[in-house]
């Protein structure tokens, strides 16, 4: 990519953060070995990456979780990458699912999501999970990012 | 990306190689359908990708492994993407984990890691696993790569 | 990337489509929140992404499936990303595998594949699975795409 004013590099990689909130939206932080290329992408309220320029973006998320089939609901663990366009309803871009493990007290599993999507100026992307209390926040296990093509 | 002298394309994709070494660092080779764009990224000692230019890189790894919960330690199989900056200690960039299968003698599972990270000139990245003897080296199952944004 | 005539952005993201065909090649559609940057990449016969320009591409696929070890053949579920170069035999680029779940009637699992490969003009890529009837086609669960570096 050119790095001139016309077409600066836009990229972000943020790190998961444990949260006491009961919301299913994962929380993220600019900590550890994070990336935030410039102010054309920002982390808002610790929960969503918001872009200022229209274009195609490769967006990805990785979620590691620890669950047990007896202790969990019967439904699988699902991670969803969601889009909130400006002034419009949110929609699902990508989802992945894993059935719970029989390991005790819980079994670790990792999910990776990634895809190319058109984002409008002011669009935000965020990650939803079925049970945020099961997410693993150890170094490197859960992260979220994007890059503008 | 421009392909002029100022901003050449930098990309690599290397293929797993079985190793008799007992190290937890995976071994890779330029074989099969591999990619090595130019000498601005190199595979060193068959174990790490080293870059000559500073910048943001999307780095990824995929590891397929075959494990069994009785035969393995109780700890999950963990794959780690690690960074060795020049003249500094190594650090973990990304990790993923999967609990062992109950299949006999072992059950196959795949892990995918990927994220955007700033690399300095001379920085190396490599992949670590908890048990390299469980890694599957059949065509296409285990690979490692990067691209400069 | 420059967006001039010389080096236009080339990217695609297509969405899985259920098929009555018994072929192991997955079917895709330009539906939902899909991406097709221009006619330098096309979806052919609903099954393969074909590119018109030579170069390095990051190619990815995500497959979510629901299987049960009793109801399935006992072999693992395997997803393969395959290349069909013009006038040459197809070859495997990437594969991932997951052992079947014991959940009833079936357990969800997701596989993600991604890597950087050189494609020739007219080359096609497609996704093969061991049992297409097990693939989950709900919003966001199964998708396929590429971007030219």
């Amino acid at each position: 990519m050119q790095k001139g004013d016309q077409n600066p590099q836009i990229a972000a990689h943020v790190i998961s953060e444990a949260s006491s909130k009961t919301t299913s939206v994962l929380q993220w932080a600019e900590k550890g070995y994070y990336t935030m290329s410039n102010n054309l992408v920002t982390l808002e309220n610790g929960k969503q990456l918001t872009v200022k320029r229209q274009g195609l973006y490769y967006i990805y998320a990785q979620v590691t979780f620890c669950s047990n089939r007896e202790a969990s609901s019967q439904a699988p663990f699902i991670a969803s990458l969601c889009l909130k366009p400006p002034n419009r309803f949110e929609r699902i871009l990508l989802r992945a699912a894993n059935t719970h493990s029989s390991a005790k007290p819980c079994g670790q599993q990792s999910i990776h999501l990634g895809g190319i999507f058109e984002l409008q100026p002011g669009a935000s992307v965020f990650v939803n999970v079925t049970d945020p209390s099961q997410v693993s926040h150890g170094t490197g296990f859960t992260s979220f990012g994007l890059l503008k093509l | 990306m421009q392909k002029g002298d100022q901003n050449p394309q930098i990309a690599a994709h290397v293929i797993s190689e079985a190793s008799s070494k007992t190290t937890s660092v995976l071994q890779w080779a330029e074989k099969g359908y591999y990619t090595m764009s130019n000498n601005l990224v190199t595979l060193e000692n068959g174990k790490q990708l080293t870059v000559k230019r500073q910048g943001l890189y999307y780095i990824y790894a995929q590891v397929t492994f075959c494990s069994n919960r009785e035969a393995s330690s109780q700890a999950p199989f963990i794959a780690s993407l690690c960074l060795k900056p020049p003249n500094r200690f190594e650090r973990i960039l990304l990790r993923a984990a999967n609990t062992h299968s109950s299949a006999k003698p072992c059950g196959q599972q795949s892990i995918h890691l990927g994220g955007i990270f700033e690399l300095q000139p001379g920085a190396s990245v490599f992949v670590n696993v908890t048990d390299p003897s469980q890694v599957s080296h059949g065509t296409g199952f285990t690979s490692f790569g990067l691209l400069k944004l | 990337m420059q967006k001039g005539d010389q080096n236009p952005q080339i990217a695609a993201h297509v969405i899985s489509e259920a098929s009555s065909k018994t072929t192991s090649v997955l079917q895709w559609a330009e539906k939902g929140y899909y991406t097709m940057s221009n006619n330098l990449v096309t979806l052919e016969n609903g099954k393969q992404l074909t590119v018109k320009r030579q170069g390095l591409y990051y190619i990815y696929a995500q497959v979510t499936f629901c299987s049960n070890r009793e109801a399935s053949s006992q072999a693992p579920f395997i997803a393969s990303l395959c290349l069909k170069p013009p006038n040459r035999f197809e070859r495997i680029l990437l594969r991932a595998a997951n052992t079947h779940s014991s959940a009833k009637p079936c357990g969800q699992q997701s596989i993600h594949l991604g890597g950087i490969f050189e494609l020739q003009p007219g080359a096609s890529v497609f996704v093969n699975v061991t049992d297409p009837s097990q693939v989950s086609h709900g919003t966001g669960f199964t998708s396929f795409g590429l971007l030219k570096l």
Epitope: - | T64, E70, P105, C106, Q134, F141 | -
Partner: antibody, heavy 118, light 107 residues
């Protein structure tokens, strides 16, 4: 219908090696495991090792470790078992068999008689 | 290694008899126990897998039971074609091991 067809009988000298092949047809050989089991004349069954052909993972019985090598060629749907440093007590019928999730062996080759004699 | 002990080592029975063969593991193998039938000069044939699951195509007169260390193969009504040697096999841990076999002969 899955079929496993093994190579023909062999007569070998002590200290030499033998390589037995097992070609699969009629099923998805490559995504299952292949085990090798031997049976000495008038004796019971003895498991030697296992390979997952397309993945390349192997497991060996400790008794044969270092003396047996199991390989597979995905392109030809063929598995191989090579046993080195042969001795007279290795005289046996060697079977390949397809192994499934629970470690059961559901399809067997016809067997290959290997005779070790000076 | 896990030792598998079958009993009896041989038995004589008549057509129509109910026959029971037992297999004991030297340590718990959960349900990872398989049963095979072998006739002279032939390869073994899978009858029962995972302790009690009947292999496709095998007559329903064959059944398996047990878990942990003690397992049983039962032939509810012996048929002429059932005279053979029967082996149990554990697949819980490497190396997989077989019992020494039980030969079922005509009385």
């Amino acid at each position: 219908q899955v079929q496993l067809v093994q190579s023909g009988a062999e007569v070998k000298k002590p200290g030499s090696s033998v390589k037995v092949s097992c070609k699969a047809s009629g099923g998805t050989f490559s995504s299952y495991g292949i085990s090798w089991v031997r049976q000495a004349p008038g004796q019971g069954l003895e498991w030697m090792g296992w390979i997952s052909p397309i993945f390349g993972n192997t497991n060996y019985a400790q008794k044969f470790q270092g003396r047996v090598t199991i390989t597979a060629d995905e392109s030809t749907s063929t598995a191989y078992m090579e046993l080195s440093s042969l001795r007279s007590e290795d005289t046996a019928v060697y079977y390949c068999a397809r192994s499934r999730y629970y470690g059961d062996l559901d399809y067997w080759g016809q067997g290959t008689l290997v005779t070790v004699s000076s | 290694d896990i030792q598998m002990t079958q009993s009896p080592s041989s038995l004589s029975a008549s057509v129509g008899d109910r026959v029971t063969i037992t297999c004991r593991a030297s340590q718990s193998i959960s349900s990872y126990l398989n049963w095979y039938q072998q006739k002279p000069g032939k390869a073994p044939k899978l009858l029962i897998y995972y302790a009690n699951s009947l292999q496709s195509g095998v007559p329903s007169r064959f059944s398996g039971s047990g878990s942990g260390t003690d397992f049983t193969l039962t032939i509810s009504s012996l048929q002429p074609e059932d005279f053979a040697t029967y082996y149990c096999q554990q697949s819980d841990s490497i190396p997989w091991t077989f019992g020494q076999g039980t030969k079922v002969e005509i009385k």
